[in-house]
């Protein structure tokens, strides 16, 4: 997960945009990525970075959980 997020974040050269990506990775079981992104007011660049990283992180976590279930963990 960390490697993949670092790979995505590396393309954002504006520090705030990069941090928006990292914010998207934080675990929040109560809201979807879309719901969380809707509260961002600093600009579309932040929304885009946040959403991309949030979705990728959610997918990777879901895949890992699925693998764990398959392995009977």
């Amino acid at each position: 997960l960390q490697e993949k997020i670092e790979e995505i974040a590396a393309k954002y050269k504006h520090l705030v945009v990069k941090k928006c990506c990292y914010d998207g990775v934080r675990i929040n079981h109560d809201e979807t990525c879309e719901q969380r992104a809707a509260r961002i007011s600093v600009g579309p660049r932040c929304v885009k970075a946040f959403t991309e990283c949030c979705v990728v992180a959610s997918q990777l976590r879901a895949n890992n959980s699925h693998k764990d279930l398959q392995l009977g963990r």
């Epitope: 393309k11 050269k13 504006h14 520090l15 705030v16 945009v17 941090k19 007011s41 600093v42 600009g43 579309p44 660049r45 932040c46």
Partner: antibody, heavy 118, light 111 residues
Framework: QVQLVQSGAEVKKPGSSVKVSCKAS????????IHWMRQAPGQGLEWMGY????????NYNENFKGRVTITADKSTSTAYMELSSLRSEDTAVYYC???????????WGQGTTVTVSS | DIVLTQSPASLAVSPGQRATITCKAS??????????MNWYQQKPGQPPKLLIY???NLDSGVPARFSGSGSGTDFTLTINPVEAEDTANYYC?????????FGGGTKVEIK
């Protein structure tokens, strides 16, 4: 309407520090990044750094080698730029500006003249 | 850091004529289809004023005689026709990455 109002002109001795303020009004202060630029007499614009007041995130131009510190007071909607170890080459007009959509500077302060002289 | 090189450094134009200023970036200021190049006008004793953002979008209240174009590393600001009040310094600026950088400026004088 959106306004950025800066503090008044300063005259400083070499080696001292200066702190310039930039009071924002007419919009939600925490929604936009505040940048600081400077312009030496007859010269172009030089970017110094910025702060995102909502999170306190900052980034600085490495040319200033740790001499610049940008802070923000959310309670008064004011951003500050402090420059230390002043030298004569720091004589310039210092501007704050709001960055809209993480793309462009749509509103600027009126500028603060800082003169460094012994 | 992205270096922005403006040319010419100064320009004298007759009223009614066209003024063209170019800005060349040391690397692309495009990102995922968007251009992060902006243009500002600065008159003596005043702060810079936004003219054009994202390469070609006119800020509100800016006369239509100002236009911007370009992509990647090469950008142009055009004033057509030039008017007397356009006497000023013009700066390009990129915001695709930190540190934000400005071009060296172009001084436009009206003959």
């Amino acid at each position: 309407q959106v306004q950025l109002v800066q503090s008044g002109a300063e005259v400083k001795k070499p080696g001292s520090s200066v702190k310039v303020s930039c009071k924002a009004s007419g919009y939600t202060f925490t929604d936009h990044i505040i940048h600081w630029m400077r312009q030496a007499p007859g010269q172009g614009l030089e970017w110094m750094g910025y702060i995102y007041p909502r999170e306190g995130w900052t980034n600085y131009n490495e040319n200033f080698k740790g001499r610049v510190t940008i802070t923000a007071d959310k309670s008064t909607s004011t951003a500050y730029m402090e420059l230390s170890s002043l030298r004569s080459e720091d004589t310039a007009v210092y501007y704050c500006a709001r960055e809209r959509n993480l793309e462009y500077f749509d509103y600027w302060g009126q500028g603060t003249t800082v003169t460094v002289s012994s | 850091d992205i270096v922005l090189t403006q040319s010419p450094a100064s320009l004298a134009v007759s009223p009614g004529q066209r003024a063209t200023i170019t800005c060349k970036a040391s690397q692309s200021v495009d990102f995922e289809g968007d251009n992060y190049m902006n243009w500002y006008q600065q008159k003596p004793g005043q702060p810079p004023k936004l003219l054009i953002y994202a390469t070609s979008n006119l800020d509100s209240g800016v006369p239509a005689r100002f236009s911007g174009s370009g992509s990647g590393t090469d950008f142009t600001l055009t004033i057509n026709p030039v008017e007397a009040e356009d006497t000023a310094n013009y700066y390009c600026q990129q915001s695709v990455e930190d540190p934000h950088t400005f071009g060296g400026g172009t001084k436009v004088e009206i003959k």
